[in-house]
């Protein structure tokens, strides 16, 4: 159930409506809960979660990552630069979230919910952003060929890719959440 639609909200119509910031915060935490469920299934199925960063680094996925220059960390914090990075990063993650579909057995609905909730989050954030021109949208053709390439990997690499996407997306969202709470 997406944020704002749970039974508690229905049962409390007198409650103050959520502000834009609260809605974004709640949306990110909802997606993080979804990622947690997916990671649980992945980690129960394989030992990928115990892999060290060094082993993971061998996989050459170009997943979005926060860096100091993006203005989202405590040092060098820059609201506008950071917001652009968050939106751009989420847009870049969309192809990887598409890859995750059909990668789960017992959590298939959860994978779909993470994907759909991310689309909603992007919309929320785009409303908040002043400098939409600075946001680059990934090229659909490049995304399509990347998806084909990922799906053609062997089973072990597909498991590793799934684990890496979930871990990186969780990390990216948590960095985003911390930064958005400063705005």
């Amino acid at each position: 159930v997406p944020p704002g639609e749970d039974s508690k909200d229905v049962a409390a119509p007198h409650r103050q409506p959520l502000t834009s910031s609260e809605r974004i915060d709640k949306q990110i935490r909802y997606i993080l809960d979804g990622i947690s469920a997916l990671r649980k299934e992945t980690c129960n199925k394989s030992n990928m979660c115990e892999s060290s960063k060094e082993a993971l680094a061998e996989n050459n996925l170009n997943l979005p990552k926060m860096a100091e220059k993006d203005g989202c960390f405590q040092s060098g914090f820059n609201e506008e630069t950071c917001l652009v990075k968050i939106i751009t990063g989420l847009l870049e993650f969309e192809v990887y979230l598409e890859y995750l579909q059909n990668r789960f057995e017992s959590s298939e609905e959860q994978a779909r919910a993470v994907q759909m909730s991310t689309k909603v989050l992007i919309q929320f954030l785009q409303k908040k952003a002043k400098n939409l021109d600075a946001i680059t949208t990934p090229d659909p053709t490049t995304n399509a060929s990347l998806l084909t390439k990922l799906q053609a990997q062997n089973q072990w690499l597909q498991d590793m890719t799934t684990h890496l996407i979930l871990r990186s997306f969780k990390e990216f969202l948590q960095s985003s959440l911390r930064a958005l709470r400063q705005m």
Epitope: E22, D25, R29, L32, D33, S36, R39, K40, C43, C49, E50, S52, K53, K65, M66, A67, E68, C72, F73, Q74, S75, R167, S168, E171, F172, Q174, S175, R178, R181, Q182
Partner: antibody
């Protein structure tokens, strides 16, 4: 079982430096946020600094910003706190803590604490 | 920065009593609040995270409630081993901040 063992504390003069280490075992270190918390003699707990899993994102209390640097070596399962320009008010027991998290929980909270290492800044 | 105001600083009580400690945040912190217990000469211990979630192994007489700016830790039926200092911590946004602490002691 989870273990956090701090070392590197001691007596240092004002303006001096110390490097604290925290050796972690019993869990996949790289999956967790780690935090330093300190407690001055007879006083309450004070959050000092946190470092996140893979992003390199760090955060500091205003009282130590620009003087302390938190870092981690995931290959060595070790957390560090480099403390420069030490002041007498930095005198405290420094605890290394593990943040709830890893695979499931996203909420803040420190579920494991080391025994602490004493740092005394005095001339 | 978000300030945390914990009260009371000292709480004289009797065994078997119900004890309530409050923590007030200077702005909304959602449910990003945890509670810790520290006994003299010991390291702190996590009791509650996410404002109301009981940490594994913590007795059920401990409970947490609240959201936004106002939070409460309740000990229902104080036992001798509960005599300690309790701290709240906001983990919503940096710099994270502990409350000043509440010492629960016998009258």
């Amino acid at each position: 079982q989870v273990q956090l063992v701090e070392s590197g504390g001691g007596l240092v003069q004002p303006g001096g430096s110390l490097r604290l280490s925290c050796a972690a075992s019993g869990f996949t270190f790289s999956n967790y946020y780690m935090t330093w918390v300190r407690q001055a003699p007879g006083k309450g707990l004070e959050w000092v600094s946190s470092i996140y899993s893979f992003s390199g994102d760090t955060a500091y209390a205003d009282s130590v910003k620009g003087r302390f640097t938190i870092s981690r070596d995931n290959a060595k399962n070790t957390l560090y706190l480099q403390m420069n320009s030490l002041k007498s008010e930095d005198t405290a027991v420094y605890y290394c803590t593990r943040n709830l998290g890893g695979v499931v929980v996203t909420t803040n909270g420190y579920d494991y604490w080391g025994q602490g290492t004493q740092v005394t800044v005095s001339s | 920065d978000i300030q945390m105001t914990q009260s009371p600083s000292s709480l004289p009580t009797s065994l078997g009593d119900s004890v309530t400690i409050t923590c007030q945040a200077s702005q909304s912190i959602s449910d990003e609040l945890s509670w810790y217990q520290q006994k003299p000469g010991q390291t702190p211990k996590l009791l509650i995270y996410g404002a109301s979630k009981l940490q594994t192994g913590v007795p059920s007489r401990f409970s947490g409630s609240g959201s936004g700016t106002s939070f409460t830790l309740t000990i229902s039926g104080l036992e001798a081993e509960d005599l300690a200092t309790y701290y709240c911590l906001q983990g919503y946004s940096w710099p994270f901040m502990f409350g000043q602490g509440t010492k629960v002691e016998l009258k």
